[in-house]
């Protein structure tokens, strides 16, 4: 591993969708992929009238989005479906909104999901 | 390097039967889920069915549902697509493909294809 | 289903032009969106994923963006190698659906 880089080997996973697109609903992730490819986690979420649904968790792969990011925050301005990544293992158990357009100080909304359980 | 391998294609009248194999290599086989997708002549990619790492969760486009059966043979690094009730719109190159995550963020490695033909 | 919308559908271009083609879907996708290239009897390969990342192999000149509903695939400086079919296909839920494709050919 490159040294100062947390190397993601794991992440929380969660599909909201999961009888539909038939995976597990929540679960722990091995993250694999190309040696030559850096690895992350990702939370994406909807915010219904103040509401946080989780709608995906798991392992996304080399993505420069995600870089060195140790924190899984959103920073897009008030998307349809909020989105972070991160590295190191299960950084997407918290995730949280920061958007950068606001001209005042922006309020943090970290959400802990409710702990993994295999099926 | 990783190789996934079709066969099994071939001509079938309507109302028959084909299994497809998809035999697969330079990766660890059993930690991936797995995909078909099939390309009619002349036509566009159109997504078939995809199986879990561990065989335990299958999905189904609804134009085969209760007409193809994927399965998987871990110990054998074998993907399989049975194919009963055929009809002429499944004449198609068949390929199977790797999914990237559990949750199939892309299709990062595909076969060559093997071209299933139904006529009378 | 998730809808996916391409355009143009098919396009003329010479070597060394810069070419943009776009993908639509039909609701949100956040950034699961994927291009493939695709070549006349041949199977189709990952040129991006996740949006905006390149696969392994593939040359700089081809770049993604987008994301939600909107993305573009560009080849900034087209080479013979990139005439071919491309197309998008989102991952967000099952079943993955796919473009129609954009037959790239030369002018």
């Known amino acids: 591993a490159i040294l100062g880089r947390s190397e993601t080997q794991e992440c929380l996973f969660f599909n909201a969708n999961w009888e539909k697109d038939r995976t597990n609903q929540t679960g722990v992730e091995p993250c694999y992929g190309d040696k030559d490819k850096r690895r992350h986690c990702f939370a994406t979420w909807k915010n219904i009238s103040g509401s946080i649904e989780i709608v995906k968790q798991g392992c996304w792969l080399d993505d420069i989005n995600c870089y060195d990011r140790t924190d899984c925050v959103e920073k897009k301005d008030s998307p349809e479906v909020y989105f972070c990544c991160c590295e190191g293992n299960m950084c997407n158990e918290k995730f949280s909104y920061f958007p950068e357009m606001e001209v005042t100080q922006p309020t943090s909304n970290p959400v802990t999901p409710k702990p993994p359980y295999y099926n | 390097e990783v190789q996934l391998l079709e066969s099994g294609g071939g001509l079938v009248q309507p109302g028959g039967s084909l299994r497809l194999s998809c035999a697969a290599s330079g990766f660890t086989f059993d930690s991936y889920g797995m995909h078909w997708v099939r390309q009619a002549p002349g036509k566009g990619l159109e997504w078939v069915s995809s199986?879990?790492?561990?065989?335990?969760?299958?999905s189904y486009a609804d134009s085969v549902k209760g007409r193809f059966t994927i399965s998987r043979d871990n110990s054998k690094n074998t993907l399989y697509l049975q194919m009963n009730s055929l009809r002429a719109e499944d004449t198609a190159v068949y390929y199977c493909?790797?999914?990237?995550?559990?949750?199939?963020?892309?299709?990062?490695?595909w076969g060559q294809g093997t071209l299933v033909t139904v006529s009378s | 289903d998730i809808q996916m919308t391409q355009s143009p559908s098919s396009l003329s271009a010479s070597v060394g032009d810069r070419v943009t083609i776009t993908c639509r879907a039909s609701?949100?996708?956040?950034?699961?969106l994927n291009w493939y290239q695709q070549k006349p009897g041949k199977a189709p390969k990952l040129v991006i994923y996740a949006a905006t990342s390149r696969a392994s192999g593939v040359p700089s000149r081809f770049s993604g963006s987008g994301s939600g509903t909107d993305f573009t695939l560009t080849i900034s400086s087209l080479q013979p190698e990139d005439f071919a079919t491309y197309y998008c296909q989102q991952s967000y839920e099952n079943p993955l659906t796919f473009g129609g494709g954009t037959k790239v050919e030369i002018k």
């Open positions: 493909a790797r999914a990237a995550t559990w949750h199939d963020t892309h299709l990062d490695y």
């Open positions: 199986i879990n790492y561990n065989g335990g969760y299958t």
């Open positions: 609701q949100s996708i956040v950034s699961y």
